[in-house]
Interface confidence: medium
Amino acid sequence: RGVFRRDAHKSEVAHRFKDLGEENFKALVLIAFAQYLQQCPFEDHVKLVNEVTEFAKTCVADESAENCDKSLHTLFGDKLCTVATLRETYGEMADCCAKQEPERNECFLQHKDDNPNLPRLVRPEVDVMCTAFHDNEETFLKKYLYEIARRHPYFYAPELLFFAKRYKAAFTECCQAADKAACLLPKLDELRDEGKASSAKQRLKCASLQKFGERAFKAWAVARLSQRFPKAEFAEVSKLVTDLTKVHTECCHGDLLECADDRADLAKYICENQDSISSKLKECCEKPLLEKSHCIAEVENDEMPADLPSLAADFVESKDVCKNYAEAKDVFLGMFLYEYARRHPDYSVVLLLRLAKTYETTLEKCCAAADPHECYAKVFDEFKPLVEEPQNLIKQNCELFEQLGEYKFQNALLVRYTKKVPQVSTPTLVEVSRNLGKVGSKCCKHPEAKRMPCAEDYLSVVLNQLCVLHEKTPVSDRVTKCCTESLVNRRPCFSALEVDETYVPKEFNAETFTFHADICTLSEKERQIKKQTALVELVKHKPKATKEQLKAVMDDFAAFVEKCCKADDKETCFAEEGKKLVAASQAALGL
């Protein structure tokens, strides 16, 4: 069957059940339900999934059976709306159930919560986990899907199946090992970190589609796929972009069965046509489905064709530029973006999109001018400052990172961003600045040619986290402006923000700076977060504090924690020394 060309099916639910198989069907329905009803207990979701699965089986047996012709949204929405505690648990989300499809599904989507009020996932002892895994492997793995999906309501569902497969493999291997913990814990840490990164990347794709539309996503995809597959023809890249857009539109829209099915079809198509796409796909295409799709999504850029001619001939010097542009603007701009991106794997996708936007704006203006060619002849000169800006920023920040190390680099960013947008909640500032700071260890090790795509595209993902968290409870007009005006200019917009002079400093509250002996038992990461939380609060109290003042206070704070954690009577030390520290800090900062 051709990619996405399906015969009309009498029963959509039967069709997807047959395509995906029972195991994937059940897993995807569980993910979908957990992403919609994020507060519901695990057992309730399992019950709903089992009911849907039994119903799907009746439709497989007889596609003409009652209700089998209903859309998946209707079937799933009806099922979600049977939850007895909907009003008490979710408040106004219960009003969604009074709506008809497709409005009901849109309503559920709008109530997805990027920061749900759920307890932090605490990792049990290894023996406890291994016992649970052996006692009931199926329930153990379902619980993993459920816990990740409800905390990450936009997690890319087919990719979550891949994570679950790796999660299972880790327990299968390590629960038999001599040193279970040494085997298992690093694997779980890796899955956790990769999972958070995967969630954040997908969140940006969904934000791109939902806030800026399909055209914005397609432009991003043209640029990225052209960098990755520079030997593929423009028509081939366009085909992949169209299909990839469909896949992500479905997943971001909660259509997880269709999304997973279409992603599998796309992987199949890519592997069947790898000769005309990329020489780097061979290994990926030998893997099983979930691994194959993941591998394709992460595959390295193919080598650029050796004999690519100058871009200027077709896009500046040709007398047909305005004619070609007028005939089909998006196709012509798509060709420009394709040609530019395949020549520049060293540029970030967002930079390529800024260049394409500049080119488009120039043609809009010049093709209406008396002498179009004279008007657009120097368009490529306008690209120079756009290219240099991220290059310089990355150079400066990598130098700072190499000088300070990750923790202190994060602190520098915490201070910088708190001064820019002090109204943002402290937990959000800490989370976002810590992630921004990770760009150093992630990207600064790369050679020049790989730094910009690594750094700027990663920063786009992190700043999107700030945007989605801020959208839930907007407190800063400056954040709203940078987040909503232009997807590709978010990072330059935030970079350009200076200290917010309109901010009225927060009242000093000694309680914020009171610490207890429990800090001593925290992991190094948790201890860092405590210190960084205090740093943000300091800046909110004293936005005009100098680097030197803040450094002195933070050094005193670190010494205070170290001293009291070594004391015999830790709690007394924290109480007495803490008062002295607060007083000294107030004096140092002039509070």
Epitope: G2, F4, E233, A235, K239, Y269, A313, D314, D320
Partner: nanobody, 119 residues
């Protein structure tokens, strides 16, 4: 040797329909993206529509969107253009061509078929 042979043109009244065909040989049709271009009397070339080797996606010039439909039958090595709601400004010689590998240069095209829209 690459050959592209267009047919189906003719005289039609405004608002009428025509279906153009293009028989291809001499290259692997089912791995080639194809397009229709046209040239009105005394004017330059204008591209009309593109179709990927698999049949999707398809692209249309703004001037024909919603009226023309491009399709292909890979088993017959044939490209089609269904033209509805024809207008006088659609009068042109229509050529089928193999889509360019990258730049705006078309690799191969046929002799063309004339479409005249007039009352």
């Amino acid at each position: 040797e690459v050959q592209l042979l267009e047919s189906g043109g003719g005289l039609v009244q405004p608002g009428g329909s025509l279906r153009l065909s293009c028989a291809a040989s001499g290259f692997t049709f089912d791995t080639s993206s194809m397009l229709w271009v046209r040239q009105a009397p005394g004017k330059g070339l204008e591209w009309v529509s593109v179709i990927h080797q698999s049949g999707t996606p398809t692209y249309y010039a703004d001037s024909v969107k919603g009226r023309f439909t491009i399709s292909r039958d890979n088993s017959k090595n044939t490209l089609y253009l269904q033209m509805n709601s024809l207008r006088a400004e659609d009068t042109a010689t229509y050529y089928c061509a193999k889509f360019p590998s990258s730049r705006m240069k078309f690799d191969y095209w046929g002799q063309g078929t004339l479409v005249t829209v007039s009352s």
